[in-house]
């Protein structure tokens, strides 16, 4: 029988009546075009919905948009289009929502061809009121908020000017011309690249990297011969053209670009690319593309300085620059990442790491599943997960994998069970332990979302036909109940729940179609009466993360420590609540060689935990360029993995000596860097 239809499934009592009393329909008085939805703030219940409708006329396109606001998580909406003077809003810029709970919103309007500049509508009270502001430029990008101060905005103009506002878009100042890319750093710093000659495209590889720490009063050139740059965690990366040829290399800075070191990564040619897959304050995952149009590359993981890299995974699927990769951070368990590799026979396989890229392995076959036609051995196969690449290939995969930090251990994904990803219709699988073990959760493709920090999982079947049924589970996907939320089926377009998975409300979006007209409609269902009571201490059980061998003293040790969590019992039907905080207790582990990566000049042979010297460097002094100084390294080959908290046990020796020699490693050394003020 299908999952959730076995006899042992405990029924949630009287759920139909409870849900019927908490189902709210809203029909939008719109012709169907496109709809976009944004949550304003956290736990505010405020949702903005922008509907747009284009009518292509012979000479021009006529557009109409409407703005709606809800302050009860989508149960009721009010048309507030008059607050923005019935102006047509440009959907390609979306709704720029301010960070944290600032309550700020910026909408960018469509203006007629001859106007001097663009127009925005600004709100700083969670979209209760809007102020119209005419801009002295035409925006090329959405307004970007400073993460530290939501009054500070930056935008690029269609003429490549960098514009900054210090008063939430009321007044704008062009702080630099000829700008290609601009990003906020920490402490209200702005990093940007500029071109000197023709254009961004023409000067690629000859761009300059600039920094301003005072919103454009003064500037510092922190790099030349730049191809591109990126920020990840506390690292600033730049790909820099080599002097002699068309190759480029990654340089890294941890002091906002004052000093740079060359990353120990392969250089790439014109057709290749680097990509920061993930970064935190400890380390970075870097993808380096293979030469040629292979569609794959290599993942490297960095040390704590972003300089020394260990090869993490070969043949990593990544189609082209800005293309598709399945790399996914499993946010519900520390150290876990999932991605795809392209095998020699061109099939795609899923790999998982539980230790932040130290080792990769196939996903364990779900116990309740058979190996499919891709499997050579019908008894031995793995689960393969569909992610961005499958979606881009138009496979029947409506959603990427889902995990939430406050729903500990839960991962939901579409997948197939075999030797490789299958093009057949996938099923939905769930893991309750961060990806170690998997169970088939639902037959066929579904949309899914997590509510109440994992207390409820909601799913809707992916179908080309109109739907009127929603499924929900209160036991992490073991048992499912179905609820008919409307008599009249709708063409389903999406599930929406408040980011953070703390809400108990879910909105089902779609449209109705009749002979003459089609309209947007939403149904918001509040599950609060299904989870009648607040969870108590007895509703939680203790779970040790990363546990694979209960008899082993080091069971659960990952990156030098283990963590026990309080997890909701599957049998408990209760509310975690909006204020739920994940309860965990860490304990430190003894160090082993697994807690160290191989240092500069060393590598780990396959299936060996020891680091050995690279043959080509044997007998040579290990000298490399660090922060613009030549360094001499005395090491027995090990460096602690970033973020690893182990203590005692194995303790390899390591010493770095400053050789007091200057080196520029192809890049601006500090004394060559210039500053200027406006």
């Amino acid at each position: 029988s299908a999952p959730g239809e076995d006899e042992e499934c405990g029924r949630v009592r009287d759920f139909v009546a409870k849900l019927a009393n908490n189902t709210h329909q809203h029909v939008f008085d719109d012709l169907r075009g496109s709809v976009s939805l944004s949550w304003v703030g956290d736990s505010t219940g405020v949702i903005l919905v922008l509907t747009t409708f284009h009518v292509p006329l012979v000479i021009m396109t006529f557009g109409q948009s409407k703005l709606y606001r809800s302050e009860d998580y989508g149960k009721n909406f009010k048309d507030i289009t008059d607050l923005i003077n019935n102006t047509f809003i440009r959907t390609e810029f979306g709704m720029a929502i301010g960070p944290e709970n600032s309550g700020k919103v910026v909408l960018t309007a469509e203006v007629s061809g001859g106007s001097r500049g663009g127009r925005i509508f600004r709100s700083s009270d969670f979209a209760k009121n809007f102020v119209q502001t005419d801009l002295p430029f035409h925006p090329l990008t959405q307004m970007m908020y400073s993460p530290q101060n939501s009054d500070y905005l930056l935008a690029l103009s269609t003429e490549n000017g960098l514009w900054v506002s210090k008063n939430f878009g009321g007044k704008w100042e062009e702080i630099h011309k000829a700008v290609c890319l601009a990003k906020w750093g920490s402490d209200n710093t702005i990093f940007f690249t500029t071109y000197a000659n023709g254009s961004c495209k023409a000067d690629l590889g000859a761009l300059e990297l600039w920094r301003t720490s005072d919103l454009g009063k003064s500037f510092k050139t922190i790099g030349v011969k730049i191809y591109s740059f990126g920020l990840g965690g506390r690292f600033l990366f730049a790909s820099v053209m080599a002097d002699k040829d068309t190759t480029r290399r990654i340089h890294v800075s941890t002091d906002q670009g004052d000093t740079w070191s060359m990353a120990q990564l392969p250089s790439v040619g014109q057709e290749q690319f680097y990509s920061i897959l993930a970064a935190n304050d400890d380390m970075v995952f870097m993808h380096v593309d293979e030469p040629g149009d292979t569609g794959f590359g290599t993942i490297f993981t960095s040390d704590d300085r972003g300089i020394v890299y260990s090869k993490s995974l070969d043949r990593h699927l990544y189609t082209t620059t800005g293309g598709e990769t399945d790399f996914t951070n499993v946010t519900s368990l520390r150290g876990v990442y999932i991605t795809s590799v392209l095998s020699e026979d061109n099939s795609i396989q899923t790999m998982i790491t539980f230790d932040q890229g130290g080792r990769w392995t196939h996903l364990r076959k779900p116990e309740n599943s058979e190996c499919d036609a891709t499997a050579k051995n019908k008894n031995e196969c793995s689960l393969h997960i569909h992610a961005s690449y499958s979606i881009s290939q138009k496979l029947n995969v409506p959603m990427a994998p889902l995990s939430e930090p406050n729903a500990v251990g839960i991962v939901i994904a579409h997948g197939s069970v075999g030797d490789a990803i299958s093009v057949m219709v996938p099923d939905v699988y769930i893991s309750d332990d961060g990806g170690y073990s998997w169970t088939k959760m639902l037959e066929g493709p579904h949309y899914y979302t997590i509510l109440d920090s994992g207390g409820i999982i909601v799913a809707i079947e992916h179908s080309s036909r109109p739907i009127n049924v929603i499924k929900f589970s209160t036991d992490e996907g073991q048992c499912w109940q179905t609820y008919t939320f409307t008599r009249d089926p709708i063409y389903f377009t999406g599930l929406a729940s408040e980011p953070g998975a703390r809400s108990m409300n879910i909105s089902i979006w779609g449209f109705t179609e009749s002979f003459l007209t089609s309209q947007w409609v939403s149904y918001t269902i509040d599950f609060k009466d299904i989870l009648e009571r607040n969870c108590e201490e007895k509703d939680y059980t203790i779970w040790l993360a990363h546990s694979t061998d209960p008899e082993d003293y080091e069971d659960g040790c990952i990156l030098g420590y283990k963590e026990q969590f309080l997890r909701l019992r599957k049998s408990s039907v209760c509310q975690n609540g909006r204020d739920y905080v994940v309860t965990k207790q860490p304990s430190i582990c003894l160090c082993s060689l697994e807690d160290f990566l191989c240092d500069f000049g060393y590598y780990r042979p396959e299936n060996d935990s020891k680091c050995v010297e690279q043959p080509e460097l044997k007998g040579h002094d290990l000298e490399f360029c660090l922060y613009g100084r030549e360094e001499h390294l005395t090491t027995n080959g090990y460096r602690k993995i970033p973020g690893d908290k182990c203590q005692g046990g194995v303790n390899p020796v390591r010493e770095v000596k400053d050789l007091k020699k200057k080196c520029t490693s192809n890049f601006l050394s500090p004394e060559k860097q210039n500053s200027k003020s406006n």
Partner: antibody, heavy 124, light 107 residues
Framework: QVQLVQSGAEVKKPGASVKVSCKAS????????MHWVRQAPGQGLEWMGW????????SYAQKFQGRVTMTRDTSISTAYMELSRLRSDDTAVYYC?????????????????WGQGTTVTVSS | DIQMTQSPSSLSASVGDRVTITCRAS??????LNWYQQKPGKAPKLLIY???SLQSGVPSRFSGSGSGTDFTLTISSLQPEDFATYYC?????????FGGGTKVEIK
């Protein structure tokens, strides 16, 4: 090998307290729940509660709430169960038992290692 | 609290017999049911955990089945050392509760 060794038999007067110890060896003490179960003469098994040695957190059966205290000393891998305000119907054999673990889950898989039992007699 | 009802409370059987003991929970406990064997003067011994998984070192003549509320312990061919009292126990919801026991005696 994995074993639990309990303290010796006790004879107590009504109203007094008894503290039974359970020394674990052959496994990682911190990694498993310790349950306490009692059995009155000629009767069935009755669960009293558990302690998680690594946190020191406890869960007691309602019946014993307020009378039972479970503690542990991680330095000597020993769990303790103290029952106060003893009554004659507390006369029983008291067992400590290790909670079987399935991967990370600490509960739901029974008790796989038992102590030899401690006989507590409450009599005036 | 979840009540666990075992039946029969006692049975007589001969060596080589197939013996079945049932256990019913007052509400669904998924598959969180365990079976124990206890001999006079000894501590209980875990036989089956999670309804149907055989504890290591336990002979394969013991098997468990069921889920939800109804569970069964089967001894496929009774051996002399199997004469004992058998208890079921649910570990789904606190407090943990045991069945009243089934005493298997020699016919």
């Amino acid at each position: 090998q994995v074993q639990l060794v309990q303290s010796g038999a006790e004879v107590k007067k009504p109203g007094a307290s008894v503290k039974v110890s359970c020394k674990a060896s052959g496994y990682t003490f911190l990694a498993y729940y310790m349950h306490w179960v009692r059995q009155a003469p000629g009767q069935g098994l009755e669960w009293m509660g558990w302690i998680n040695p690594s946190w020191g957190s406890t869960s007691y059966a309602q019946k014993f709430q307020g009378r039972v205290t479970m503690t542990r000393d991680t330095s000597i891998s020993t769990a303790y169960m103290e029952l106060s305000r003893l009554r004659s119907d507390d006369t029983a054999v008291y067992y400590c038992a290790r909670g079987k673990r399935s991967s990370g889950w600490y509960e739901g898989y029974g008790m796989d290692v038992w102590g030899q039992g401690t006989t507590v007699t409450v009599s005036s | 609290d979840i009540q666990m009802t075992q039946s029969p409370s006692s049975l007589s059987a001969s060596v080589g017999d197939r013996v079945t003991i049932t256990c019913r929970a007052s509400q669904s406990i998924s598959s969180y049911l365990n079976w124990y064997q206890q001999k006079p003067g000894k501590a209980p011994k875990l036989l089956i955990y999670a309804a149907s998984s055989l504890q290591s070192g336990v002979p394969s003549r013991f098997s468990g089945s069921g889920s939800g509320t109804d569970f069964t312990l089967t001894i496929s061919s009774l051996q002399p050392e199997d004469f004992a009292t058998y208890y079921c126990q649910q570990s789904d919801v606190s407090p943990i509760t045991f069945g009243g026991g089934t005493k298997v005696e020699i016919k």
